[in-house]
Interface confidence: medium
């Protein structure tokens, strides 16, 4: 991943199309790996992680999972190649705007995990279902 | 500095077409979705039409569903709007607008200065 | 659509009032709420996003707050150029939609 002070540049090795041959450019993420949270019992979180990082590829779209045994919980936020898992799940929220938290059976602890598509979209973690839009692909084509 | 600067705009009769541009500089177009917006004389806001960054996907209000095409060219830095079947309705400055969404916070900004589309017989 | 509704429509205020105006949406939008300002014959100027974060550049005595379905714009001190006329905007669904604006006319 480009550190966040790096200016983003378009080379041979970064350019990436999609189906229509227009460049995609990579996205902006938090990024600060697995940390404690105090996340808990709410319908939303912010990450309170300070590093945004540009991805290093632009097909990768931001990630946060959230995790809670007995003993602590922790946040990660990541960037992620959508085409590949994560923690052995595929990503099938990953052209949402937002990032709103599904759980997945993890043996031993709480785990949920989200993916989204708009910048530093994985600031702000999303538990309710309230939270969630009407039509996500839609927002997405508006706003991101 | 991030500039818009709305087109094509003109008299019409109904029925008739124009077709709108939006150039842009400042920032990098083509990593960012564009929205149509419009005023009719006197009244308020009312959301056209928007595409994605990439111009892959596009989605239109109901009311011009059929009759208006929004496109871009990313590579000239502008933003099009296609209208065609033009109503009386359909009088107004017709704004467009760059979509952000930042850690789950959508909103339209910048706005150019806007183009007046009047459609009279 | 999720209906949005300013109040009031108008009103009348003097430089250094606190003006406060009010946005209701037809059903819960979390916080995914806009304020903008627009002048006659300029385009809409974003103030307020995410319905509390001032946008850079934009003067701190203007502020938002509210969340679900009822929201505030306040202008703590009201200045000569903030007369114009305001709208509120939902981005949680599909289509984004406005208020009908409240127009800022001096006293």
């Known amino acids: 991943t480009i550190p966040p002070h790096v200016q983003k540049s378009v080379n041979n090795d970064m350019i990436v199309t999609d189906n229509n041959g227009a460049v995609k450019f990579p996205q902006l993420c938090k990024f600060c790996d697995v940390r404690f949270s105090t996340c808990d019992n709410q319908k939303s979180c912010m990450s309170n992680c300070s590093i945004t990082s540009i991805c290093e590829k632009p097909q990768e779209v931001c990630v946060a999972v959230w995790r809670k045994n007995d003993e602590n919980i922790t946040l990660e936020t990541v960037c992620h190649d959508p085409k590949l898992p994560y923690h052995d799940f595929i990503l099938e929220d990953a052209a949402s705007p937002k990032c709103i938290m599904k759980e997945k059976k993890k043996p031993g602890e709480t785990f949920f995990m989200c993916s989204c598509s708009s910048d530093e979209c994985n600031d702000n973690i999303i538990f309710s279902e309230e939270y969630n839009t009407s039509n996500p692909d839609l927002l997405l084509v508006i706003f991101q | 500095q991030v500039q818009l600067v709305e087109s094509g705009g003109g008299l019409v009769q109904p029925g008739g077409s124009l077709r709108l541009s939006c150039a842009v500089s400042?920032?990098?177009?083509?990593?960012?979705?564009m929205s149509w917006v419009r005023q009719a004389p006197g009244k308020g806001l009312e959301w056209v039409s928007a595409?994605?960054?990439?111009?892959?996907?596009?989605h239109n209000t109901d009311s011009v569903k059929g009759r208006f095409s929004i496109s871009r060219d990313n590579s000239k830095n502008t933003l099009y709007l296609q209208m065609n079947s033009l109503r009386a309705e359909d009088t107004a400055v017709y704004f467009c607008a760059k979509g952000i969404a930042k850690s789950g916070k959508n909103y339209f900004d910048p706005w150019g200065q806007g183009t007046l589309v009047t459609v009279s017989s | 659509d999720i209906q949005m509704t300013q109040s009031p429509s108008s009103l009348s205020a003097s430089v250094g009032d606190r003006v406060t105006i009010t946005c209701r949406a037809s059903?819960?939008?979390?916080?995914?709420l806009n304020w903008y300002q627009q002048k006659p014959g300029k385009a809409p100027k974003l103030l307020i996003y995410?319905?509390?974060s001032l946008q850079s550049g934009v003067p701190s005595r203007f502020s938002g707050s509210g969340s679900g379905t009822d929201f505030t714009l306040t202008i703590s001190s009201l200045q000569p150029e903030d007369f114009a006329t305001y709208y509120c905007?939902?981005?949680?669904?599909?289509?984004?939609?406005f208020g009908q604006g409240t127009k800022v006319e001096i006293k």
């Open positions: 595409i994605s960054a990439s111009g892959d996907r596009h």
């Open positions: 905007q939902q981005s949680y669904s599909t289509p984004p939609t």
């Open positions: 059903q819960s939008i979390s916080s995914y």
């Open positions: 400042g920032f990098t177009f083509g990593r960012y979705a």
């Open positions: 995410a319905a509390s």
